[in-house]
Amino acid sequence: DGCKDIFMKNEILSASQPFAFNCTFPPITSGEVSVTWYKNSSKIPVSKIIQSRIHQDETWILFLPMEWGDSGVYQCVIKGRDSCHRIHVNLTVFEKHWCDTSIGGLPNLSDEYKQILHLGKDDSLTCHLHFPKSCVLGPIKWYKDCNEIKGERFTVLETRLLVSNVSAEDRGNYACQAILTHSGKQYEVLNGITVSITERAGYGGSVPKIIYPKNHSIEVQLGTTLIVDCNVTDTKDNTNLRCWRVNNTLVDDYYDESKRIREGVETHVSFREHNLYTVNITFLEVKMEDYGLPFMCHAGVSTAYIILQLPAPDFR
């Protein structure tokens, strides 16, 4: 059928809660493409009816909720004008107790389930919640050893738990919980995270590679909405932070009042040897003051910027 096969690593998931997987492959899905999901080499595509427990939502496959029998290999076919790629995703579903972190002793857990805090530093844990726009996520609650976390050293900020002055006692088993609403129905999402503490300074030994942007300018009309992705490849065991900054300040902090420019939620795609991370920056409305300013994507020690510029006047 002329489609190129790409095999993703196994995803290990919890039964009885929602799960979504986005069929994105930046080199391919950046242009005009169609995406279709299939299960276990079936010729019949996954339903697009939003009332279906399993359905396709734009480029996503969405399980509301995941069930024991949903384990298997799912394919998403990405068709462009001149190309076709078939991405294979192996999903393994397991049962787990509400406050569990370890997934039945399964090895090779994704980095989302294993996170590192740096001793003596201010650091954070991330609750990885990857869902399409049709899913509305409520505030996140954090637990350690089955008890809700509280104390002045802990701050919940969107999908992160900020931990100030990390101590050795912060190691252990954490869980983050959110209520997801879709088509008027509510579901509980719960992710377990095993946290270890490292004394190593900085963020690991790997140097992430920023694929895009490439220190360039983008022509954009005044008043328009603009979304720019930062695509980063990094090792699977990395602990690098990825974010957008302007004037050496996180964009979410810099534009805290107006919220006109925001950082998106990070997503990633796992390959055998590395992870590909995407975190976007959204300009709800480009203003005059945005032109000529370097907006920096940071990934560990790596940086790359974009500069917005007004389109050249058209004298035709």
């Epitope: 107790h97 972190t101 002793g105 050893d145 008890n147 509280k150 104390g151 002045e152 006692e169």
Partner: antibody, heavy 116, light 107 residues
Framework: QVQLVQSGAEVKKPGASVKVSCKAS????????MNWVRQAPGQGLEWMGM????????RYAQKFQGRVTMTVDKSTSTVYMELSSLRSEDTAVYYC?????????WGQGTLVTVSS | DIQMTQSPSSLSASVGDRVTITCRAS??????LNWLQQKPGKAPKRLIY???SLDPGVPSRFSGSRSGTDYTLTISSLQPEDFATYYC?????????FGQGTKVEIK
């Protein structure tokens, strides 16, 4: 390093109250729950309840509800467990145990003897 | 409340023996289970956290495992200092509950 130091042994009469203290050091006291566990002579371990020093939220085992009160003094990083209406079967060693990770550290124990 | 049924209540073994102690939970507790060791006149000491994570400084002859709601503490080769009482403790939901204890004695 983490240390939990408890107050000394007590002898009480039936009907009286006892207040045992547990002073914590070596970790962020207000970040983690503190548990109280007791052990009667020759018997097993029994969980009594816990308190979070950050906001003094308590959870008590049903068996001790109404008789036990756990309090905290943040200025001295000390947790207290008061048990009232003592009876002979309350004779036990009382332990505090920190849940930095679940029951990671234990105090040395305080022997409370209830005798007329 | 969650009941923890520990067996055996006591056992006699020799130095070098492999010893296995079991706890059964009356309902699902996931991996929220610790194993504690207590010697006479001393406070309990945690050996294993979250079913199978060995605490720092605890010899590798101790290990923990799980099958469903059955939890096992194994001492691969019993040493003289291992003669003590062992307790399991579930912390999945309060009230937290302990097993009745297993006294490991010298044969």
């Amino acid at each position: 390093q983490v240390q939990l130091v408890q107050s000394g042994a007590e002898v009480k009469k039936p009907g009286a109250s006892v207040k045992v203290s547990c002073k914590a050091s070596g970790y962020f006291f207000t970040s983690y729950w503190m548990n109280w566990v007791r052990q009667a002579p020759g018997q097993g371990l029994e969980w009594m309840g816990m308190i979070h020093p950050y906001d003094s939220e308590t959870r008590y085992a049903q068996k001790f509800q109404g008789r036990v009160t756990m309090t905290v003094d943040k200025s001295t990083s000390t947790v207290y467990m008061e048990l009232s209406s003592l009876r002979s079967e309350d004779t036990a060693v009382y332990y505090c145990a920190s849940s930095t990770t679940a029951f990671a550290y234990w105090g040395q124990g305080t022997l409370v003897t209830v005798s007329s | 409340d969650i009941q923890m049924t520990q067996s055996p209540s006591s056992l006699s073994a020799s130095v070098g023996d492999r010893v296995t102690i079991t706890c059964r939970a009356s309902q699902d507790i996931g991996n929220a289970l610790n194993w504690l060791q207590q010697k006479p006149g001393k406070a309990p000491k945690r050996l294993i956290y979250a079913t199978s994570s060995l605490d720092p400084g605890v010899p590798s002859r101790f290990s923990g495992s799980r099958s469903g709601t059955d939890y096992t503490l194994t001492i691969s080769s019993l040493q003289p200092e291992d003669f003590a009482t062992y307790y399991c403790l579930q912390y999945a939901s309060s009230p937290y509950t302990f097993g009745q204890g297993t006294k490991v004695e010298i044969k």
